[in-house]
């Protein structure tokens, strides 16, 4: 017969014959001859392949390095990589996930729209006209105007986006 | 796969043996050093891994040295003695031997 | 060091009955299944027959069959034939600081 020239999926072409690729978690070490399968053997401890593969190595395991703020989310198998996340009160700088910064705090006047998780920041909004802010904060929201006619009291001085409203009694009528 | 280099050496004198490879890549195939003494069984020597990497049977371990170029694969014997007769097998795998040269006749005699 | 002992030697069958050869290694075997069976002939190098435990080298005759797993390993040879008097060997692989390992050999005599 012809040799091949393309071989089936999860297979490679070496020498005129197809040979089966790795399944992920192995690595290669040795074609497969006319008498035997492809040899492969499985990744070391802190190894892993993710794919069908003809690799010579497998690849580490990414290290969660906690002097960059780095904790391990999920542990890596020898099919999966580590997963890194961040400490509480940061998040990663990118996707990969390499280095974490500290979370944002949202500055009087504005308030928290989302609160960060490991792999996004604080997201702030401007406290809009009936709500203020006065504290910088990774964690509050804009918090509405105090409503004084619900306390029978009235307006003595206006709120901002960044004071509440001060309230006071209502001027008494003069006999 | 072919051995080559085998003859009659004195105790003490280097030797090395050459396996001469076609017909596949060593950059994707192990290879294995085996030797058999007259009349007795097999005995594996060492192996070289794709990367270039060696492992030796524990008796062997600073006796034997396995290394490659692209097409062969060598055995240097540093210090043979007369235990050191038999014939000397290359065979291609890493941990399942395949494919067997003919091998190549090793004598230490002084 | 990993020792493989193989078990019985010599062992003598008829044409047509079956030969079973045992291999005990002192530690598991690499994925619990990296043990091959390997004909031997006078004057000719081996000839792998069985590989992974039970898998047939291409080109095997189906009467030779493996089993086993970890430590303990079994070549059966079913209708003996003339053509199989011969030296058998088994041969494990180990982890990578290990490296691989004969066992002693086992001499089939067919009557």
């Known amino acids: 017969p012809e040799p091949p020239t393309a071989c089936r999926e999860k297979q490679y072409l070496i020498n005129s014959q197809c040979c089966s690729l790795c399944q992920p978690g192995q690595k290669l070490v040795s074609d497969c001859t006319e008498f035997t399968e492809t040899e492969c053997l499985p990744c070391g401890e802190s190894e892993f392949l993710d794919t069908w593969n003809r690799e010579t190595h497998c690849h580490q395991h990414k290290y969660c390095d906690p002097n960059l703020g780095l904790r391990v989310q999920q542990k890596g198998t020898s099919e999966t990589d580590t997963i890194c996340t961040c400490e509480e009160g940061w998040h990663c700088t990118s996707e990969a996930c390499e280095s974490c910064v500290l979370h944002r705090s949202c500055s009087p006047g504005f308030g928290v729209k989302q609160i960060a998780t490991g792999v996004s920041d604080t997201i702030c909004e401007p406290c809009p006209v009936g709500f203020f802010s006065n504290v910088s904060s990774a964690f509050e929201k804009c918090h509405p105007w105090t409503s004084c006619e619900t306390k029978d009291l009235v307006v003595q001085q206006a709120g901002t986006n960044k004071t509440d409203v001060v309230c006071g009694p209502q001027d008494r009528l003069r006999a | 796969l072919e051995e080559s280099g085998g003859r009659l050496v004195t105790p003490g004198t280097p030797l090395t043996l050459t396996c001469t490879v076609s017909?596949?890549?060593?950059?994707?195939?192990?290879m294995n050093w085996v030797r058999q003494a007259p009349g007795k069984g097999l005995e594996w020597i060492g192996y070289?891994?794709?990367?270039?990497s060696a492992g030796y049977a524990s008796w062997a371990k600073g006796r034997f040295t396995i290394s490659k170029t692209s097409t062969t694969v060598d055995l240097k014997i540093s210090s043979p003695t007369t235990e050191d007769t038999a014939t000397y097998f290359c065979?291609?795998?890493?941990?399942?031997?395949?494919?067997w040269g003919p091998g190549t006749l090793v004598t230490v005699s002084s | 060091a990993q020792v493989l002992t193989q078990t019985p030697s010599p062992v003598s069958a008829p044409v047509g009955g079956t030969v079973t050869i045992n291999c005990q290694s002192s530690?598991?075997?690499?994925?619990?299944?990296?043990l091959a069976w390997y004909q031997q002939k006078p004057g000719q190098p081996p000839k792998l027959l069985i590989y992974?435990?039970?898998k047939l080298a291409s080109g095997v005759p189906s009467r030779f069959k493996g089993s086993g797993s970890g430590t303990q390993f079994t070549l059966t040879i079913s209708g003996v034939q003339c053509d199989d008097a011969a030296t058998y060997y088994c041969?494990?692989?180990?982890?990578?600081?290990?490296?691989?390992?004969f066992g002693g050999g086992t001499e089939v005599v067919v009557k």
């Open positions: 065979a291609r795998g890493y941990n399942t031997m395949a494919i």
């Open positions: 017909g596949f890549d060593l950059s994707s195939n192990a």
């Open positions: 070289i891994t794709i990367s270039g």
């Open positions: 530690q598991n075997v690499l994925i619990n299944n990296r």
């Open positions: 992974d435990a039970s």
């Open positions: 041969q494990a692989g180990y982890s990578s600081g290990d490296g691989n390992a």
